[in-house]
Amino acid sequence: FERTRSLQDPCSNCPAGTFCDNNRNQICSPCPPNSFSSAGGQRTCDICRQCKGVFRTRKECSSTSNAECDCTPGFHCLGAGCSMCEQDCKQGQELTKKGCKDCCFGTFNDQKRGICRPWTNCSLDGKSVLVNGTKERDVVCGPSPADLSPGASSVTPPAPAREPGHSPQ
Protein backbone atom coordinates (compact mmCIF):
# COMPACT_ATOMS: atom_id res chain seq x y z
CA PHE A 1 0.00 0.00 0.00
CA GLU A 2 2.80 2.43 0.90
CA ARG A 3 4.52 1.71 -2.41
CA THR A 4 1.28 2.18 -4.32
CA ARG A 5 0.57 5.42 -2.51
CA SER A 6 4.04 6.77 -3.18
CA LEU A 7 3.69 5.93 -6.89
CA GLN A 8 0.42 7.87 -6.96
CA ASP A 9 1.68 10.78 -4.87
CA PRO A 10 5.41 11.43 -4.59
CA CYS A 11 4.68 13.84 -1.73
CA SER A 12 3.75 10.95 0.54
CA ASN A 13 7.47 10.18 0.81
CA CYS A 14 8.23 13.56 2.36
CA PRO A 15 8.71 13.14 6.12
CA ALA A 16 7.64 15.44 8.92
CA GLY A 17 9.93 18.45 9.04
CA THR A 18 9.84 18.88 5.25
CA PHE A 19 7.42 20.12 2.62
CA CYS A 20 6.75 18.73 -0.81
CA ASP A 21 7.81 21.39 -3.29
CA ASN A 22 5.36 21.51 -6.18
CA ASN A 23 7.60 23.95 -8.03
CA ARG A 24 10.67 21.73 -7.80
CA ASN A 25 9.37 18.44 -9.20
CA GLN A 26 7.85 17.56 -5.82
CA ILE A 27 11.16 17.14 -4.04
CA CYS A 28 11.14 17.20 -0.24
CA SER A 29 12.57 20.48 1.03
CA PRO A 30 13.30 21.07 4.72
CA CYS A 31 11.09 23.53 6.54
CA PRO A 32 12.96 26.81 7.02
CA PRO A 33 13.87 27.97 10.53
CA ASN A 34 10.90 28.90 12.74
CA SER A 35 8.52 26.72 10.79
CA PHE A 36 7.47 23.10 11.06
CA SER A 37 5.46 20.27 9.55
CA SER A 38 4.20 17.77 12.08
CA ALA A 39 3.17 15.11 9.54
CA GLY A 40 4.57 13.67 6.36
CA GLY A 41 3.33 14.50 2.87
CA GLN A 42 2.71 18.20 3.57
CA ARG A 43 2.87 20.80 0.81
CA THR A 44 3.54 23.62 3.26
CA CYS A 45 5.23 24.22 6.59
CA ASP A 46 3.41 26.03 9.38
CA ILE A 47 4.92 29.19 10.81
CA CYS A 48 5.95 28.59 14.41
CA ARG A 49 4.03 30.29 17.16
CA GLN A 50 6.07 33.05 18.78
CA CYS A 51 5.74 33.54 22.52
CA LYS A 52 6.15 37.28 22.96
CA GLY A 53 5.16 39.93 25.44
CA VAL A 54 3.17 38.42 28.28
CA PHE A 55 3.65 34.96 26.76
CA ARG A 56 6.81 32.98 27.46
CA THR A 57 8.13 29.88 25.74
CA ARG A 58 7.28 26.63 27.46
CA LYS A 59 8.51 24.46 24.59
CA GLU A 60 10.67 25.59 21.68
CA CYS A 61 9.49 25.11 18.11
CA SER A 62 11.20 22.31 16.21
CA SER A 63 11.03 21.30 12.56
CA THR A 64 8.28 18.81 13.45
CA SER A 65 6.32 20.52 16.27
CA ASN A 66 5.03 23.96 17.14
CA ALA A 67 6.23 26.06 20.04
CA GLU A 68 4.12 26.05 23.18
CA CYS A 69 3.59 29.15 25.28
CA ASP A 70 2.54 29.82 28.82
CA CYS A 71 2.19 33.11 30.69
CA THR A 72 4.71 35.19 32.60
CA PRO A 73 4.34 35.28 36.41
CA GLY A 74 1.30 37.27 37.48
CA PHE A 75 -0.75 35.96 34.55
CA HIS A 76 -2.46 32.67 33.73
CA CYS A 77 -3.46 30.92 30.51
CA LEU A 78 -6.90 31.05 28.97
CA GLY A 79 -8.22 29.30 25.87
CA ALA A 80 -7.06 26.29 23.92
CA GLY A 81 -3.28 26.04 23.83
CA CYS A 82 -2.92 29.13 26.03
CA SER A 83 -4.22 31.50 23.36
CA MET A 84 -4.58 34.32 25.90
CA CYS A 85 -2.97 35.41 29.16
CA GLU A 86 -5.16 36.94 31.86
CA GLN A 87 -3.96 38.87 34.88
CA ASP A 88 -3.89 37.03 38.21
CA CYS A 89 -5.71 38.46 41.21
CA LYS A 90 -5.28 37.59 44.89
CA GLN A 91 -7.44 34.99 46.56
CA GLY A 92 -10.58 36.77 47.73
CA GLN A 93 -10.71 38.84 44.55
CA GLU A 94 -12.00 38.63 40.98
CA LEU A 95 -10.87 40.33 37.78
CA THR A 96 -13.22 43.02 36.48
CA LYS A 97 -12.89 45.55 33.67
CA LYS A 98 -11.51 47.93 36.29
CA GLY A 99 -8.94 45.45 37.62
CA CYS A 100 -8.92 43.16 40.64
CA LYS A 101 -11.81 43.75 43.08
CA ASP A 102 -12.52 42.15 46.45
CA CYS A 103 -15.29 39.59 46.55
CA CYS A 104 -18.61 41.00 47.80
CA PHE A 105 -19.86 39.82 51.18
CA GLY A 106 -21.35 36.36 50.84
CA THR A 107 -19.02 35.34 48.02
CA PHE A 108 -15.51 33.90 47.88
CA ASN A 109 -12.70 32.98 45.51
CA ASP A 110 -10.01 30.57 46.68
CA GLN A 111 -7.94 30.91 43.48
CA LYS A 112 -5.94 33.62 41.70
CA ARG A 113 -8.25 33.38 38.72
CA GLY A 114 -11.96 33.07 38.07
CA ILE A 115 -14.91 34.80 39.68
CA CYS A 116 -16.22 35.10 43.19
CA ARG A 117 -18.81 32.42 43.95
CA PRO A 118 -21.57 32.49 46.58
CA TRP A 119 -20.95 30.74 49.87
CA THR A 120 -22.65 27.38 50.21
CA ASN A 121 -26.10 27.68 51.77
CA CYS A 122 -25.82 25.01 54.47
CA SER A 123 -29.50 25.23 55.38
CA LEU A 124 -30.52 23.97 51.93
CA ASP A 125 -29.06 20.61 52.98
CA GLY A 126 -30.54 20.90 56.42
CA LYS A 127 -27.12 21.58 57.90
CA SER A 128 -25.67 24.34 59.99
CA VAL A 129 -22.61 26.52 59.52
CA LEU A 130 -19.60 24.96 61.19
CA VAL A 131 -17.06 27.55 60.00
CA ASN A 132 -18.00 30.94 58.67
CA GLY A 133 -17.07 31.86 55.12
CA THR A 134 -14.59 34.55 54.17
CA LYS A 135 -13.63 36.28 50.91
CA GLU A 136 -11.07 33.51 50.38
CA ARG A 137 -12.92 30.47 51.72
CA ASP A 138 -16.35 28.92 51.49
CA VAL A 139 -18.33 28.18 54.62
CA VAL A 140 -17.91 24.75 56.15
CA CYS A 141 -21.21 23.04 56.78
CA GLY A 142 -21.61 20.86 59.83
CA PRO A 143 -24.17 18.26 60.80
CA SER A 144 -27.73 19.40 61.18
CA PRO A 145 -28.76 20.31 64.75
CA ALA A 146 -30.97 17.22 64.83
CA ASP A 147 -27.92 15.04 64.15
CA LEU A 148 -26.25 16.16 67.36
CA SER A 149 -26.47 13.60 70.16
CA PRO A 150 -28.11 14.79 73.39
CA GLY A 151 -25.71 16.69 75.57
CA ALA A 152 -23.31 17.45 72.72
CA SER A 153 -22.10 20.99 72.60
CA SER A 154 -23.53 23.25 69.96
CA VAL A 155 -21.45 23.56 66.80
CA THR A 156 -22.81 26.97 65.96
CA PRO A 157 -20.26 29.63 66.81
CA PRO A 158 -21.06 31.71 69.89
CA ALA A 159 -22.72 35.04 69.26
CA PRO A 160 -20.23 37.91 69.35
CA ALA A 161 -20.17 39.70 72.66
CA ARG A 162 -22.20 42.88 72.60
CA GLU A 163 -20.31 46.09 73.00
CA PRO A 164 -21.04 47.99 76.22
CA GLY A 165 -23.81 50.46 75.88
CA HIS A 166 -25.62 48.57 73.13
CA SER A 167 -29.02 47.29 74.14
CA PRO A 168 -30.30 44.05 72.62
CA GLN A 169 -32.30 44.45 69.40
Partner: nanobody, 120 residues
Protein backbone atom coordinates in the same frame (compact mmCIF):
# COMPACT_ATOMS: atom_id res chain seq x y z
CA UNK B 1 -7.21 45.32 11.25
CA UNK B 2 -4.26 44.36 9.06
CA UNK B 3 -3.62 46.42 5.95
CA UNK B 4 -1.07 45.55 3.28
CA UNK B 5 -0.11 48.34 0.87
CA UNK B 6 1.87 47.64 -2.29
CA UNK B 7 3.79 50.34 -4.13
CA UNK B 8 6.50 50.71 -6.75
CA UNK B 9 4.57 49.55 -9.80
CA UNK B 10 4.56 51.41 -13.09
CA UNK B 11 5.52 51.30 -16.75
CA UNK B 12 8.92 49.85 -17.61
CA UNK B 13 10.61 48.86 -20.86
CA UNK B 14 11.49 45.23 -21.60
CA UNK B 15 14.79 44.31 -19.95
CA UNK B 16 14.22 46.92 -17.25
CA UNK B 17 13.87 46.53 -13.48
CA UNK B 18 11.36 47.47 -10.79
CA UNK B 19 11.31 47.08 -7.02
CA UNK B 20 7.89 46.61 -5.48
CA UNK B 21 7.32 47.29 -1.78
CA UNK B 22 4.77 45.81 0.58
CA UNK B 23 4.20 47.66 3.87
CA UNK B 24 2.08 46.30 6.70
CA UNK B 25 0.05 48.40 9.11
CA UNK B 26 -1.85 47.10 12.09
CA UNK B 27 0.51 44.18 12.50
CA UNK B 28 4.15 43.40 11.91
CA UNK B 29 5.40 40.73 9.54
CA UNK B 30 7.13 39.01 12.47
CA UNK B 31 4.64 36.16 12.75
CA UNK B 32 3.83 35.75 9.06
CA UNK B 33 5.30 34.47 5.86
CA UNK B 34 4.97 37.14 3.16
CA UNK B 35 4.13 36.19 -0.38
CA UNK B 36 3.73 37.81 -3.77
CA UNK B 37 1.18 36.83 -6.39
CA UNK B 38 0.33 38.34 -9.74
CA UNK B 39 -2.66 38.36 -12.03
CA UNK B 40 -2.62 39.32 -15.67
CA UNK B 41 -5.85 40.38 -17.42
CA UNK B 42 -8.00 37.36 -18.23
CA UNK B 43 -5.60 34.95 -16.57
CA UNK B 44 -5.47 32.92 -13.37
CA UNK B 45 -3.67 34.28 -10.36
CA UNK B 46 -0.04 33.14 -10.40
CA UNK B 47 2.26 32.46 -7.48
CA UNK B 48 5.46 34.55 -7.47
CA UNK B 49 7.17 33.64 -4.22
CA UNK B 50 7.23 33.55 -0.42
CA UNK B 51 9.66 34.94 2.15
CA UNK B 52 10.05 33.63 5.70
CA UNK B 53 12.85 33.74 8.26
CA UNK B 54 15.62 34.49 5.77
CA UNK B 55 14.43 31.93 3.23
CA UNK B 56 12.70 32.62 -0.06
CA UNK B 57 10.74 30.25 -2.27
CA UNK B 58 9.81 31.13 -5.84
CA UNK B 59 7.37 30.09 -8.51
CA UNK B 60 8.77 28.19 -11.45
CA UNK B 61 8.28 30.93 -14.06
CA UNK B 62 10.73 33.53 -12.78
CA UNK B 63 14.01 31.65 -13.40
CA UNK B 64 16.12 33.74 -11.02
CA UNK B 65 14.88 37.12 -12.25
CA UNK B 66 12.87 37.90 -9.11
CA UNK B 67 14.16 38.27 -5.53
CA UNK B 68 12.16 38.75 -2.34
CA UNK B 69 13.78 40.47 0.64
CA UNK B 70 12.68 42.12 3.85
CA UNK B 71 13.61 45.18 5.91
CA UNK B 72 12.58 44.48 9.50
CA UNK B 73 13.18 48.05 10.66
CA UNK B 74 10.70 49.39 8.09
CA UNK B 75 8.26 46.48 8.38
CA UNK B 76 8.45 46.20 4.61
CA UNK B 77 8.98 43.33 2.16
CA UNK B 78 10.35 43.91 -1.33
CA UNK B 79 10.05 42.17 -4.68
CA UNK B 80 13.01 43.01 -6.91
CA UNK B 81 12.20 42.22 -10.54
CA UNK B 82 14.96 42.25 -13.16
CA UNK B 83 15.08 41.62 -16.92
CA UNK B 84 11.35 42.24 -17.15
CA UNK B 85 9.39 40.89 -20.13
CA UNK B 86 6.02 41.88 -21.59
CA UNK B 87 4.53 38.68 -20.17
CA UNK B 88 5.34 39.98 -16.66
CA UNK B 89 2.64 42.62 -17.12
CA UNK B 90 0.12 42.10 -14.32
CA UNK B 91 -1.24 43.41 -11.05
CA UNK B 92 1.14 42.30 -8.29
CA UNK B 93 -0.30 41.50 -4.89
CA UNK B 94 1.39 41.15 -1.53
CA UNK B 95 -0.11 38.66 0.94
CA UNK B 96 0.61 37.11 4.34
CA UNK B 97 -0.01 33.63 5.67
CA UNK B 98 0.94 31.27 8.48
CA UNK B 99 2.06 28.81 5.79
CA UNK B 100 5.34 28.53 3.86
CA UNK B 101 5.48 28.44 0.92
CA UNK B 102 2.24 30.06 -0.22
CA UNK B 103 2.13 28.38 -3.64
CA UNK B 104 -0.95 26.30 -2.77
CA UNK B 105 -2.35 28.51 -0.01
CA UNK B 106 -5.19 31.00 0.31
CA UNK B 107 -3.56 33.93 2.15
CA UNK B 108 -4.86 35.25 5.46
CA UNK B 109 -4.63 38.84 4.18
CA UNK B 110 -3.92 40.36 0.79
CA UNK B 111 -3.30 43.91 -0.43
CA UNK B 112 -5.05 45.80 -3.22
CA UNK B 113 -2.18 45.31 -5.65
CA UNK B 114 0.07 47.50 -7.79
CA UNK B 115 0.06 47.52 -11.60
CA UNK B 116 3.22 46.57 -13.47
CA UNK B 117 3.26 47.15 -17.23
CA UNK B 118 6.20 46.02 -19.36
CA UNK B 119 6.05 47.61 -22.79
CA UNK B 120 8.22 49.46 -25.23
Amino acid sequence: EVQLVESGGGLVQPGGSLRLSCAASGRTFDNYAVGWFRQAPGKEREYVGTYWSGYAHYGDFEKGRFTISRDNSKNTVYLQMNNLRPEDTAVYYCAISLKYPMATVTPDYQGQGTQVTVSS
